[in-house]
Every structure is written in structure tokens, then in C-alpha cells.
């Protein structure tokens, strides 16, 4: 038994026929000693007398609100809730399995940007006698604070014959570091109580994996003279992280005919405009995605081809400004070839995702991630890789990136990737390995040797262990090169001499 909140206790029960249950001793919160009687909410009879009441809790009939009285006056209450475990599995009767992106997904979370603010939601068909409370932290062993509001009913839908209720909650990381590479996941815990049943649901994720930008805003068409072509232009959504030279988006432009069966024309661009052929009755849609990390695409913003005009796409609120102005050269060291580094790091991002595209749908953290990839270098909050840190002195950050590149280059050349099971001949891991080396050489100043981090001795004995390690290394490499690419993109835009 444990206390959920003041005067509310959860009794954990193994649920099987003729289970012995749990013995619970309730104590009346009063200085009184004599003449105390006990009742249970759903029964009118007196259960016992005295300052304490001992009960055997076996089933829901034993749960509920216990009240101690003296002479018609209520002295205190204790609410007992049951948490059922059947065949070693805690019950999940209250929430609906959303089955996306995989089975047993009860909580889903999204973030519009890297500010540390995110929203989680869940579904239920229950509408009465239902309460939720939400807690969150970053990491679990030494948790860092995340503040969540109250869960609220956010939508009601009719699904076939049934009503479905969507609840949501907004959370904010207390000391968010938008530019850092996350090494510890956010943990979200939802306590759900339906009548006398307690259940808890958890989700664990990195903000980078739940990013879904708002749709591009101010989508406009400008017909080009003497042509069927139009120039489509748009802006970053207001809710996206700034500066945009650092937190960059990529866009997908789609021309869709009136009929859903018509072939869609799609163009991908990093710019905020594109030239497309616009047929009558067609519409143009644009969506956005983080440029360096393959998280979710935004919803589409759309505008009809007939007549120019603004979009129907949502634009949010909050956030400000775009890229910064040109800045002075880097103190305490030569400036790197920012543009070359930008191009190569963006290529690295593409390669890292093509080497392991499905990784976003696999929860590798369940596989004891801590001991295997804890030792990889992460770009942390104090490493000066944020826009302000780069302005002040980019050398700290560049040294950190260089260390990481060498580290991953060595890992990709190690037995983990060269051993069995052999990589496919056309695997992008070889190109990835070469590009890591190329970028690290671009960064290494002449006659200047930064110290590199010791490579941990990871020698998996089994092929399946090697496979799992590859997934995990590529997964963390994706996060690392995304931050590196942001750094170089921002440097190229604002720090190039």
C-alpha cells in the first residue's frame, strides 16, 4: 500500500481466483481513543470500532472511502483504491490503446519547437467518476524538473456507436536547453482513477523525437508573367524556435488536382519559396519538417490555385524573429570553413537517417540503453553550441563537435559495424564513416590537436547484440549530427567572414 495523495491510498493486488489480498490497517486521524466506529462509503453497516481498523483487501468491494466517526461526527476519511496486476501485468482498463506508432501506446506527446514545452494526450470512452493527474521529469534516476498543468478534456468525438473523450496536458521543462543534444529522455507519468480503480501510464521520449512544427504561415501565390508557373512563398510558423538560421526547417510543396486520384507533384526545398505549375482547380500545399532531424512533418497549409491569396494553414502564436545579422570572426582560433562544414554536416544528417530510417519507430531505450551508449559524447548545455555561445567563442563548441566526430568515426570503423552480420554492399554506413572523417578534418586546425575522447571497449559477443548496438549508435549519431548541422548552418549565416 502507498499514499497517492493525502488520505488516498493505493493497494496493489495480484488478481487471480482466491488471491489472499492485502491486509491493511487504517488509523483514525484523531486524538480521540474511545467510542470510534468505522463505515465504508458503499455500505451502511458499521465495520468495526476503535482507533484502528484492520481489513483484508481482496476485491473492489473492500475498496472505497472508509470513514471513522464518533457520536455522529466524522473524524477522518481514508480512500482506498485498487491497482490490479494480472499475470504480472498492471491493468490498462481506463485508457484506449492508440496503437500509433505501435501497440500499447496510451499516451501520445508532441512539441511545436525545442523550448521544452510539449503537450500529451490520451483517449478514453469513460466520462464519469474519472480523474487524472500528471507528473513529468527529465531522467528518472536523478530527475530534473518538468512542470505540468492540469489534464483537461480537450475533445469529444463520436466513433461509430461510441463517444470517445480526449484529455490533454501541457508541460514545460523548468530549465530547458533548446540547442543541446538531449541525453536523458523526458518521462511522463499519468495517474488515472476510475471509480475505485487506480492505473498508471508512462511515456518516455526525447523532445527531438516528438517535434511537429505548426504549418507554414502566410502562404501566398504570385503568378509569373507569360507563364503557367506561380511563385509560392511562405514563412516559418510563429511557434517555431528561433533564430531560424540555427533552428532551420525544410519544406515540401505539393500541387494537388481537384481529384484525389490525380498524380501529386511534390518539390522539396530549404527555402521559403518555390516555383510550381498551378493548374486551374488545383491547390498548393506546403508543410514543414526539422531540416536536420527527421521528426514529424507539420500539417499542410493550403491555398487554391485560382486567384492568389493567403493560406488556410494554421499559424500559431509566440516566438519571434528570424536569423541574426553577420557577426565578428571567432576569437581565440581560426574560423572554420563554415559553408563547407554546413554542406558536409547536412549530408551527414541525410546519411545518418538513410543508414537507419526506421529507427524513429523503435523504442531502443527499452533495451537497456544506459550501459551501451551512455559513453558517447553529447553536445551539452554548457558546450557553447547555442547561438549565443557561438557568437561569444565558437571554439568551445567546435572542439566538442570535433571530439564527437572522431568518436563516431572510430565506432563506425570498429568491429561493431565491420563484424557479423555483414552490412549490405550498398549500405550508407561506409559513406557515413567517410563523411565523419572528412568533416573532422575540415574542423581540425593546422598544427592544433584537440584531445579526443577515449573510445569505450564495446565488444558485443553475439550478432544480435551487435545489431542492437548499431541501431543505438546510429540513433545517437542522428541526434549529434543534427546539432552539429545547426551549428554550422548558423555559423555560415552569421559568422562567416
Amino acid at each position: 500500500i502507498w499514499e497517492l495523495k493525502k488520505d488516498v491510498y493505493v493497494v496493489e493486488l495480484d488478481w487471480y481466483p482466491d488471491a489472499p489480498g492485502e491486509m491493511v490497517v487504517l488509523t483514525c486521524d484523531t486524538p480521540e481513543e474511545d467510542g470510534i466506529t468505522w463505515t465504508l462509503d458503499q455500505s451502511s453497516e458499521v465495520l468495526g470500532s476503535g482507533k484502528t481498523l484492520t481489513i483484508q483487501v481482496k476485491e473492489f468491494g473492500d475498496a472505497g472511502q472508509y470513514t471513522c466517526h464518533k457520536g455522529g461526527e466524522v473524524l477522518s476519511h481514508s480512500l482506498l483504491l485498487l491497482h490490479k496486476k494480472e499475470d504480472g501485468i498492471w491493468s490498462t482498463d481506463i485508457l484506449k490503446d492508440q496503437k500509433e506508432p505501435k501497440n500499447k501506446t496510451f499516451l501520445r506527446c508532441e512539441a511545436k519547437n525545442y523550448s521544452g514545452r510539449f503537450t500529451c494526450w490520451w483517449l478514453t470512452t469513460i466520462s464519469t467518476d474519472l480523474t487524472f493527474s500528471v507528473k513529468s521529469s527529465r531522467g528518472s534516476s536523478d530527475p530534473q524538473g518538468v512542470t505540468c498543468g492540469a489534464a483537461t478534456l480537450s475533445a469529444e468525438r463520436v466513433r461509430g456507436d461510441n463517444k470517445e473523450y480526449e484529455y490533454s496536458v501541457e508541460c514545460q521543462e523548468d530549465s530547458a536547453c533548446p540547442a543541446a543534444e538531449e541525453s536523458l529522455p523526458i518521462e511522463v507519468m499519468v495517474d488515472a482513477v476510475h471509480k475505485l480503480k487506480y492505473e498508471n501510464y508512462t511515456s518516455s521520449f526525447f523532445i527531438r523525437d516528438i517535434i511537429k512544427p505548426d504549418p507554414p504561415k502566410n502562404l501566398q501565390l504570385k503568378p509569373l508573367k507569360n507563364s503557367r508557373q506561380v511563385e509560392v512563398s511562405w514563412e516559418y510558423p510563429d511557434t517555431w524556435s528561433t533564430p531560424h538560421s540555427y533552428f532551420s526547417l525544410t519544406f515540401c510543396v505539393q500541387v494537388q488536382g481537384k481529384s484525389k486520384r490525380e498524380k501529386k507533384a511534390r518539390v522539396f526545398t530549404d527555402k521559403t519559396s518555390a516555383t510550381v505549375i498551378c493548374r486551374k482547380n488545383a491547390s498548393i500545399s506546403v508543410r514543414a519538417q526539422d531540416r536536420y532531424y527527421s521528426s514529424s512533418w507539420s500539417e499542410w497549409a493550403s491555398v487554391p490555385c485560382s486567384g492568389s491569396g493567403s493560406s488556410r494553414g494554421g499559424s500559431g502564436s509566440g516566438g519571434s524573429g528570424g536569423g541574426g545579422s553577420k557577426l565578428r570572426a571567432v576569437p581565440g582560433g581560426s574560423s572554420p570553413a563554415w559553408t563547407q562544414c554546413q554542406q558536409l554536416s547536412q549530408k551527414l544528417c541525410t546519411l545518418a537517417w538513410s543508414a537507419h530510417p526506421l529507427v524513429g519507430h523503435m523504442d531502443l531505450r527499452e533495451e537497456g540503453d544506459e550501459e551501451t551508449t551512455n559513453d558517447v559524447p553529447h553536445i551539452q548545455c554548457g558546450d557553447g553550441c547555442d547561438p549565443q555561445g557561438l557568437r561569444d567563442n565558437s571554439q568551445f563548441c567546435l572542439q566538442r563537435i570535433h571530439q564527437g566526430l572522431i568518436f563516431y568515426e572510430k565506432l563506425l570503423g570498429s568491429d561493431i559495424f565491420t563484424g557479423e552480420p555483414s552490412l549490405l554492399p550498398d549500405s550508407p554506413v561506409g559513406q557515413l564513416h567517410a563523411s565523419l572523417l572528412g568533416l573532422s578534418q575540415l574542423l581540425q586546425p593546422e598544427g592544433h590537436h584537440w584531445e579526443t575522447q577515449q573510445i569505450p571497449s564495446l565488444s558485443p559477443s553475439q550478432p544480435w547484440q551487435r545489431l542492437l548496438l548499431r541501431f543505438k549508435i546510429l540513433r545517437s549519431l542522428q541526434a549529434f549530427v543534427a546539432v552539429a548541422a545547426r551549428v554550422f548552418a548558423h555559423g555560415a549565416a552569421t559568422l562567416s567572414p
Epitope: 462509503d41 458503499q42 476485491e59 473492489f60 468491494g61 472505497g64 472511502q65 480512500l79 491493468s91 482498463d93 470512452t125 469513460i126 466520462s127 464519469t128 467518476d129 461510441n162 463517444k163 471509480k195 475505485l196 480503480k197
Partner: antibody, heavy 121, light 107 residues
Framework: QIQLVQSGPELKKPGETVKISCKAS????????MNWVKQAPGKGLKWMGW????????TYADDFKGRFAFSLETSASTAYLQINNFKNEDTATYFC??????????????WGQGTLVTVSS | SIVMTQTPKFLLVSAGDRVTITCKAS??????VAWYQQKPGQSPKLLIY???NRYTGVPDRFTGSGYGTDFTFTISTVQAEDLAVYFC?????????FGGGTKLEIK
Amino acid sequence: QIQLVQSGPELKKPGETVKISCKASGYTFTNYGMNWVKQAPGKGLKWMGWINTYTGEPTYADDFKGRFAFSLETSASTAYLQINNFKNEDTATYFCARSLSTMITTTFAYWGQGTLVTVSS
Amino acid sequence: SIVMTQTPKFLLVSAGDRVTITCKASQSVSNDVAWYQQKPGQSPKLLIYYASNRYTGVPDRFTGSGYGTDFTFTISTVQAEDLAVYFCQQDYSSPYTFGGGTKLEIK
């Protein structure tokens, strides 16, 4: 002991309004939700909805939205069901039913004796 | 809404017999099922809640079981005073629906 006492039978013409009362005693009225259940002659039971006796907020089943209204007179520990624009298909016995506990609203531990409302053509 | 299909509709039994009534929900209702007894000319009485918990003062010849979609109500030894209609009810999801009832008659 806990009791729910309902008002007597009613004979109504189509289009008229009927208001049934349900007086509770033997417990703290505002601690438990009050439900309303319909039973047409010779038929089964149909849950109409409930009213939160603490906040006064009613919840109606979809089939009973519009012409039906739940209300309270807390000082008199009384709940009311009003049916407007009475129709033939409203002929039934209406029961008020108290929730089993503060945590279990829609299991019905105590029932009123029922009020038969009949349409007279 | 969730449909509660109750079988059989009628039962003709002798005193002392064992009686079983079943209720099938059109989707999972966890263990949020109650059973009521309605004697002729009376209001219903709660017998079982949370699928298997006997309500205060209910004789132990009445038992309930089940989880998810399939529920059973049993009278181990029928007595003359058990002549009534028995209803199941799901109180998991709104609207809270009742089975069609089982009329128990004594030979």
C-alpha cells in the same frame, strides 16, 4: 435509514409539462449523484442521465437531451425531473436512483418507488 | 452505445435449482457491471456491483463473475422469494445501458 420518496402518479395530455420530485433522507444529499431511469410499461430499464448534487450540473444521455431537465432544491434534499412537451412515448415509470458511493456514480444502490406518468389522449 | 445482450429471456425453475444468467457486452466494459433484481410492482434492488461484489445485505446464494465482455450471474439455490426480473447493467461508459432482463418464474 436511507430513503428516496417520489411524487405520485400523473396523467398528462400530449404537449403538457410534467415535473416529478424525489425527496432524499437518511444521508448527506450533496455527497451522492442522483440518477434518473425510465421504464416503459412491460419493458426494460433505460438510464436517462444524472445530476451532480454538489454542483448542480446535469448530464443527459443522448436520447434524453432537449425536452428533459434535471434540477435540485438542495435545501429540501430534493431532485426534480421535468419533461416538456409530453409525448405518447414518454408514458413510463420514472425512477430516481442514488449512486452507490461518492466514487461510483452510475451504479444505483437506492431507488425511489417510481412515478408512473401516463399520456391521456 | 454499448449493447448488453442478456440471456435467457425467461427461466422456469424449481425451488432449490441452480440458475445462471449471462450478459454479453458489445465491447469491453472491464469489470464495471452491476446486477439488479426487480420484483413485481417494485423498484429494482442492487445485488452485485463491480461484476462480483455482493452488495450489503444480499444473501450469499447470489454471485457474479466475469470481466471484459462476458458476465455471469448465478443463484446457487433458488428460493420462492427469488421470483423476479433480473437485469445486468454496464456502468463503464455513457450511456450506462441495461440488459433486456431475465424473468425468473418458479414452478
